[in-house]
Interface confidence: low
């Protein structure tokens, strides 16, 4: 296909340095369609237009990537650029409707991630949920998700809510949660690793 990718790249390359930075920051909090993960913040901030285009397409595929890019541009007040992007991607692309794309799959790694293997134990035994949320906020958790977890009354229900978002995460996102757990409750991780 490629048309949508070229249109995304064309739009991003036409942004000023300040606009590109603003685009990236908005991308961190823009609502995502269910089943899609968020590009990790650390990687995102250092990318130029070309890297960012590739990342958008690899995370969201071409059709949804273009739609998401247009949404962010529109949110920035760049309506004309958003319109041009959408027009370019709809010209005879022959793409399947955006709504039926599969979410990006986790990186191919053997077996279940530690986080998935020990889901029940983590729900029952993690006590420092606030720390985890602070660590994950803006990287893998959106504002809405962050608030939703915090709104839960108990630690287990907070963790259960947190796990409701993990099906959309890739391996890297789950690694971030594991790293946060190692830093906040290392004894728990060590205990589970031994089990």
């Amino acid at each position: 296909m490629g048309r949508a990718r070229d249109a995304i790249l064309d739009a991003l390359e036409n942004l000023t340095a300040e606009e590109l930075k603003k685009f990236k920051l908005k991308l961190l909090s823009v609502p995502l369609r269910e089943g899609y993960g968020r590009i990790p913040r650390g990687a995102l901030l250092s990318m130029d237009a070309l890297d960012l285009t590739d990342k958008l397409v690899s995370f969201y595929l071409e059709t949804y990537g273009a739609e998401l890019t247009a949404n962010v541009l529109r949110d920035m007040g760049l309506q004309e650029m958003a319109g041009q992007l959408q027009a370019a991607t709809h010209q005879g692309s022959g793409a399947a409707p955006a709504g039926i794309q599969a979410p990006p799959q986790s990186a191919a790694k053997p077996g279940l991630h530690f986080i998935d293997q020990h889901r029940a134990a983590l729900i029952a035994r993690v006590t420092n949920v606030e720390w985890l949320l602070d660590a994950l906020y803006g990287k893998v958790l959106t504002d809405e998700q962050y608030q939703a977890v915090r709104a839960e009354p108990t630690n287990p229900s907070k963790m259960r809510k947190l796990f409701s978002f993990t099906p959309a995460w890739n391996w890297t996102c789950k690694d971030l949660l594991l790293q946060a757990l190692r830093e906040s409750q290392s004894y728990l991780v060590e205990d589970l690793e031994r089990s």
């Epitope: 961190l28 913040r41 650390g42 606030e130 803006g138 915090r150 709104a151 971030l176 790293q179």
Partner: antibody, heavy 117, light 111 residues
């Protein structure tokens, strides 16, 4: 950006308490941590603690536990910090600040608290 | 608690020259590949104003003459070229763990 409004000054007697307010404009008050910072005259900044308006969850600097109590009134979009058993050491400017992602990027203008008999 | 030591305590820089302020942490403030250090400026009678977050990210609306660098325990704020309006006290602050702490401040004077 959310604006934070604070009263200008409070004069209180030693041993008394004072309640400092911080009113947020805009309807995003419930989404962000509100932080409190102390600055004594001609001195640096000290982090007191934070409160999340959605559920009144708090984290305190141990140094200020028992001295500062953080509360919120969601209906009015106002955060409060009560300082108790005041001494001359508590004379300072107290700032509220809002953290949107990683750092405190919106600040009130500060409330000057003077403890004097 | 993590102690942040700023140096120098004060400095005077000629208009158009470079100002460099250092902030050293008593232990690493890096985690998850992020450097949890932020820089603020404060003018007399005003609240602090965020300049740089996560060691090197420029806050929206802050002039590009401000830049931050560093990782682990050592961080630097650079201002180049220095302008008249940059006369202020500069603070570093970490958010790596509770309690968050600030450096002692560096007072910048423009010659």
């Amino acid at each position: 950006r959310v604006q934070l409004q604070q009263a200008g000054a409070e004069l209180v007697k030693p041993g008394a308490s004072v309640k400092v307010s911080c009113k947020a404009s805009g309807n995003t008050f419930n989404n962000y941590w509100i932080y409190w910072v102390k600055q004594r005259p001609g001195q640096g900044l000290e982090w007191i603690g934070r409160i999340h308006p959605s559920d009144s969850g708090t984290n305190y600097n141990q140094k200020f536990e028992g001295k500062a109590t953080l509360t919120v009134d969601k209906s009015s979009g106002t955060a409060y910090m009560q300082l108790s058993s005041l001494t001359a050491e508590d004379s300072a400017v107290y700032y509220c600040a809002l953290l949107s992602l990683y750092a405190m990027d919106s600040w009130g203008h500060g409330t000057s608290v003077t403890v004097s008999s | 608690d993590i102690v942040l030591t700023q140096s120098p305590a004060s400095l005077a820089v000629s208009l158009g020259q470079r100002a460099t302020i250092s902030c050293r942490a008593s232990k690493s403030v890096s985690s998850f590949g992020y450097n949890y250090i932020h820089w603020y400026l404060q003018k007399p009678g005003q609240p602090p104003k965020l300049l740089i977050y996560l060691a090197s990210d420029l806050e929206s609306g802050v002039p590009a003459r401000f830049s931050g660098s560093g990782s682990g325990t050592g961080f630097t704020l650079n201002i180049h070229p220095v302008e008249e309006e940059d006369a202020a006290t500069y603070y570093c602050q970490h958010s790596r763990e509770f309690p968050w702490t600030f450096g002692g401040g560096t007072k910048l004077e423009i010659k």
